[in-house]
């Protein structure tokens, strides 16, 4: 997260850290005991699932594997659209204050809303600065027509913008498949952005869920 | 120090099949991307394809596509290019190269290894 | 997919000259578009990225401007260090990564 500062202790329980051993991979959010859902893009072959802790690393977080995930059937490696995957918990997460279930969207949310995106990603970019605890910043919901003046055709039609303008304000390496969070539904999973991170008036660009919670829960009921 | 090595120099008949690899170090290898660009004596240089060294995920140049097959071991960080059903016109220079950018996009190559030489000849 | 023409293709300099180089792509690729230094025997280097942004450790005296179509790489004041060839690339419409021929900056 570039710009942005220590998410409120427990103001995130819901947030996930998928790693590689025990280094970070990727961002993501428990939707129930069972599901983490995250950005396509993330895709391993197996997982390790941080939660229920702020800090990484820390001995009192959960940490449990995961072996299964299902990407978005539509998702392309060369246009990055519908970026979003669910990965199955090998066992189920133990819900408390610490670990709580997201909530998914039952509408979008629209530009101009305040939404905070979070992670454990770097804090510098193109040099690297990995925070041990979470990470947040506020960003706007900025509208597609205001996006595609900068990203152009990149910009596909589930894909939602975020940003502050002329400030660095965004998401960054590791945060990939984190939530962007906005009237405490989740409207975002971070999916990319220009590099070096945090360039000024170069929007975040986020999958936007509230068009996918049929898939999502589909999907799901299908795995079960 | 964050490098990319490649392997050595190979002489190849046409018809075989030849296989490059890089090795990364000094970075996290399963964070980037790695693709694959050659360059014919005296030529420019040619894009052959990329894979997510995390996903396995690759994308092929349409001209290559059925001949090349790109692969990553993470346990060693090295990326692999194989590039079969050797011709003439194969014989180049190949590089291995890491794109930049954060999450599903990147957008330019900072660093490249230090290249191998593949010829082909009866 | 997307062409990149460079020109010239080549070009003959003397030490302390401002050199210009040339990017055209085929349609508009907004200011995604990299310039790279290639000296013989040796690997491309990344010199600007995003048309105008220099790369850390990268003199100064390059830089680049342009967006849509249109790209320039100048050299303010050519180093003897300079003479190399020098390649764009663009990443907008990927896959595939496509190169421009390169230009080839030799001694006057």
């Known amino acids: 997260i570039i710009d942005g500062a220590p998410c409120a202790r427990g103001s995130h329980p819901w947030q996930v850290a998928l790693l590689s051993g025990n280094q970070l991979h990727c961002g993501g959010v428990l939707v129930n005991e069972r599901w983490v859902l995250t950005a396509a893009h993330c895709k391993m072959n197996e997982y390790t699932v941080h939660l229920g802790s702020d800090t990484l690393g820390d001995r009192r977080a959960q940490r449990i594997k995961a072996s299964k995930s299902f990407r978005h059937p539509g998702y392309s490696t060369q246009t990055h659209v519908n970026d979003l995957m669910l990965v199955k918990l090998n066992s189920q997460a133990r819900l408390s204050s610490m670990v709580k279930k997201v909530r998914l969207p039952s509408r979008c949310e629209p530009p101009g809303t305040t939404c905070t995106v979070s992670g454990w990603g770097t804090t510098t970019s193109p040099d690297v600065t990995f925070p041990s605890d979470l990470m947040c910043v506020d960003v706007k919901l900025i509208s597609p027509q205001d996006c595609t003046k900068v990203y152009k055709d990149l910009l596909e039609n589930s894909m939602l913008c975020a940003g502050i303008p002329d400030s660095k304000k965004n998401a960054c390496n590791g945060d990939s498949g984190g939530p962007l969070v906005c009237r405490g539904t989740l409207q975002g999973l971070v999916s990319w952005g220009t590099f070096p991170c945090g360039q000024p008036n170069d929007p975040g660009v986020y999958t936007q869920v509230c068009k996918f919670t049929k898939w999502i829960n589909d999907t799901m009921k299908k795995h079960r | 120090q964050v490098q990319l090595v490649q392997s050595g120099a190979e002489v190849k008949k046409p018809g075989a099949s030849v296989k490059v690899s890089c090795k990364a170090s000094g970075y996290t290898f399963t964070s980037e991307g790695i693709h694959w660009v050659r360059q014919a004596p005296g030529q420019g240089l040619e894009w052959m394809g990329s894979?997510?060294?995390?996903?396995?995920?690759?994308n092929y140049a349409q001209k290559l596509q059925g001949r090349v097959t790109m692969t990553t071991d993470t346990s060693t960080s090295t990326a692999y290019m194989e590039l079969r059903s050797l011709r003439s016109d194969d014989t180049a220079v190949y590089y291995c190269a890491r794109s930049a950018g954060y999450g599903a996009r990147h957008w330019y190559f900072d660093l490249w290894g230090q290249g191998t030489m593949v010829t082909v000849s009866s | 997919d997307i062409q990149m023409t460079q020109s010239p293709s080549s070009l003959s300099a003397s030490v302390g000259d401002r050199v210009t180089i040339t990017c055209r792509a085929s349609q508009s690729i907004s200011s995604y578009l990299n310039w790279y230094q290639q000296k013989p025997g040796k690997a491309p280097k990344l010199l600007i990225y995003?048309?105008?942004s220099l790369q850390s450790g990268v003199p100064s005296r390059f830089s680049g401007s342009g967006s849509g179509t249109d790209f320039t790489l100048t050299i303010s004041s050519l180093q003897p260090e300079d003479f190399a060839t020098y390649y764009c690339?663009?990443?907008?419409?990927?896959?595939?990564?496509?190169f421009g021929g390169g230009t080839k900056v030799e001694i006057k």
């Open positions: 690339d663009q990443w907008y419409s990927t896959p595939p990564i496509t």
């Open positions: 995003g048309a105008s």
């Open positions: 894979i997510s060294a995390s996903s396995g995920d690759t």
